[in-house]
Amino acid sequence: TQNKALPENVKYGIVLDAGSSHTSLYIYKWPAEKENDTGVVHQVEECRVKGPGISKFVQKVNEIGIYLTDCMERAREVIPRSQHQETPVYLGATAGMRLLRMESEELADRVLDVVERSLSNYPFDFQGARIITGQEEGAYGWITINYLLGKFSQKTRWFSIVPYETNNQETFGALDLGGASTQVTFVPQNQTIESPDNALQFRLYGKDYNVYTHSFLCYGKDQALWQKLAKDIQVASNEILRDPCFHPGYKKVVNVSDLYKTPCTKRFEMTLPFQQFEIQGIGNYQQCHQSILELFNTSYCPYSQCAFNGIFLPPLQGDFGAFSAFYFVMKFLNLTSEKVSQEKVTEMMKKFCAQPWEEIKTSYAGVKEKYLSEYCFSGTYILSLLLQGYHFTADSWEHIHFIGKIQGSDAGWTLGYMLNLTNMIPAEQPLSTPLSHSTYV
């Protein structure tokens, strides 16, 4: 064993997505000699870490090491041993940790410090754990889907590699929905981006892109639900909240302390004459939709056009990939088909929300009740956010493609993040060498 094992002609990378509700580990693989080619990196594994998001470990940081063990061990099994020491590991934390940092920078730092110490114990090339910004989350999601769709390739293909790929080089917009935030990112058509905070300039493969992005903190599906509950309990006459976003017959007790635990509900906080209240579902899509709309302040806009809460949004342009919870929720509701119109989606949501809870539980016996109970709210929220929040219309709805995977890789920010940190997206178009033609065969 006197010589370092010859490295394989493939490379690997690991990215952990530390989201608000859970952590997922992604393993990527690519041919070593084609690092600068577009579309060569693909996902070989996803491992969902058992348990909640890392922000929930604030009072039990000593458990973080055990929490990460199974997925890190899985990575050791999937990646050849000879590659371990050269495999970079990155952890990016998103809105759950952004919220924790808003509450206490010290607590957020403590969690990240333990995460870093745990990950550095593995025989990989650990490159750090950090809270990524909402702007990065949006940008990397946009890079991921366009990289996987082949939009950065200068070769115009006459064939389609994915069902919704058009032959033109026009990029897709990215719509990302998490538990604590949601991102919208796209290239506007000849439109000045009026707010500098929402403007990104990229030069990728020899082409310039002026990209609009915004991340709405507290408008992920879980935090939006907390917001809605905090808003609605203000006007409840007693400790019963009759909620149209839950199925008829559904009942759940909520602690007021849990409701006000998140910074997202601070604007609705008030002293209530009870410590707990009971949600009683009444299952009415229209009323649920109306309640959700009250979370979007559309009365104020200092720009030519806004999404909500005074945030600039240029006119929508082109096709959009909607992924993460946009996809998971719509997939569960069987509404991801390209053929389903917005009117049909609304109709189906009305029927779904009106179904009695007992009936729903029987129909979906294999689904955890906590998740099952929230699909009516989540589906309604997605419609409200896309239509009233981002101003999609019945006509432009057909430009939204609900995407789980592209070419076997999950749509999301992690691939874009790794491509950026490993310098695998060159600013200029790589020079074609005689040997590289095999790439296109």
């Epitope: 064993t1 006197q2 010589n3 370092k4 094992a5 000879s82 020491q85 114990n121 090339d125 650990f126």
Partner: antibody, heavy 121, light 107 residues
Framework: EVQLVESGGGLVKPGGSLRLSCAAS????????MNWVRQAPGKGLEWVGE??????????HYAESVKGRFTISRDDSKNTLYLQMNSLKTEDTAVYYC????????????WGQGTTVTVSS | EIVMTQSPATLSVSPGERVTLSCRAS??????LHWYQQKPGQSPRLLIY???QSISGIPARFSGSGSGTDFTLTISSVEPEDFAVYFC?????????FGGGTKLEIK
């Protein structure tokens, strides 16, 4: 020829300090994780700690028994590994070996000859 | 930490005999188990890595097996130069830990 040569051992009083060195030759030192392993007289082997590469920000890991007292460092330009030992205790008395793995990780296929550290009043 | 337990502590055998040394880990370490030989006054020498992988220059009479928590080092026919102390090592996770050793002595 691949070689590791330790130096710097000797007699030191409890509470004192000592710095061990390990000169590496015959391989590209900067590309390999390096370790210290010790062996108390008549006893078994005990891993002391490791240091990784510049690309790993020279990350270090230590055995619980030496954490906070011992520091491993490296100078890639001099092909040298160091072990700074502070607040020494009598139980730190041992032969200290500099080791590495030239293939894969966390086993040791190259060992130095060892240097003896005696902690006694 | 992973505790490595070797048995027996001492093994008396005659040259030419087949011997089996045992090593047990306190939790599963897959095949991340390595074996070393140490002679008096010398540095340890790697014999087997990853439970069963042989090293060039090490006689073929040395072989390793096992996975998970139980491992063995076998010397098919003991030679006089094999009388030494043998250590197993957890190479799975930090801290790296060694067994207490098995002393192989002449009967």
């Amino acid at each position: 020829e691949v070689q590791l040569v330790e130096s710097g051992g000797g007699l030191v009083k409890p509470g004192g300090s000592l710095r061990l060195s390990c000169a590496a030759s015959g391989f590209t030192f900067s590309k390999y994780w390096m370790n210290w392993v010790r062996q108390a007289p008549g006893k078994g082997l005990e891993w002391v700690g490791e240091i990784r590469l510049k690309s790993n920000k020279y990350g270090t890991h230590y055995a619980e028994s030496v954490k906070g007292r011992f520091t491993i460092s490296r100078d890639d330009s001099k092909n040298t590994l160091y072990l700074q030992m502070n607040s020494l205790k009598t139980e730190d008395t041992a032969v200290y070996y500099c080791t590495t793995q030239l293939d894969l990780y966390w086993f040791f296929d190259v060992w130095g000859q060892g240097t003896t550290v005696t902690v006694s009043s | 930490e992973i505790v490595m337990t070797q048995s027996p502590a001492t093994l008396s055998v005659s040259p030419g005999e087949r011997v089996t040394l045992s090593c047990r880990a306190s939790q599963s370490i897959s095949d991340y188990l390595h074996w070393y030989q140490q002679k008096p006054g010398q540095s340890p020498r790697l014999l087997i890595y990853y439970a069963s992988q042989s090293i060039s220059g090490i006689p073929a009479r040395f072989s390793g097996s096992g996975s998970g928590t139980d491992f063995t080092l076998t010397i098919s026919s003991v030679e006089p130069e094999d009388f030494a102390v043998y250590f197993c090592q957890n190479g799975h996770s930090l801290p790296l830990t060694f067994g207490g050793g098995t002393k192989l002595e002449i009967k």
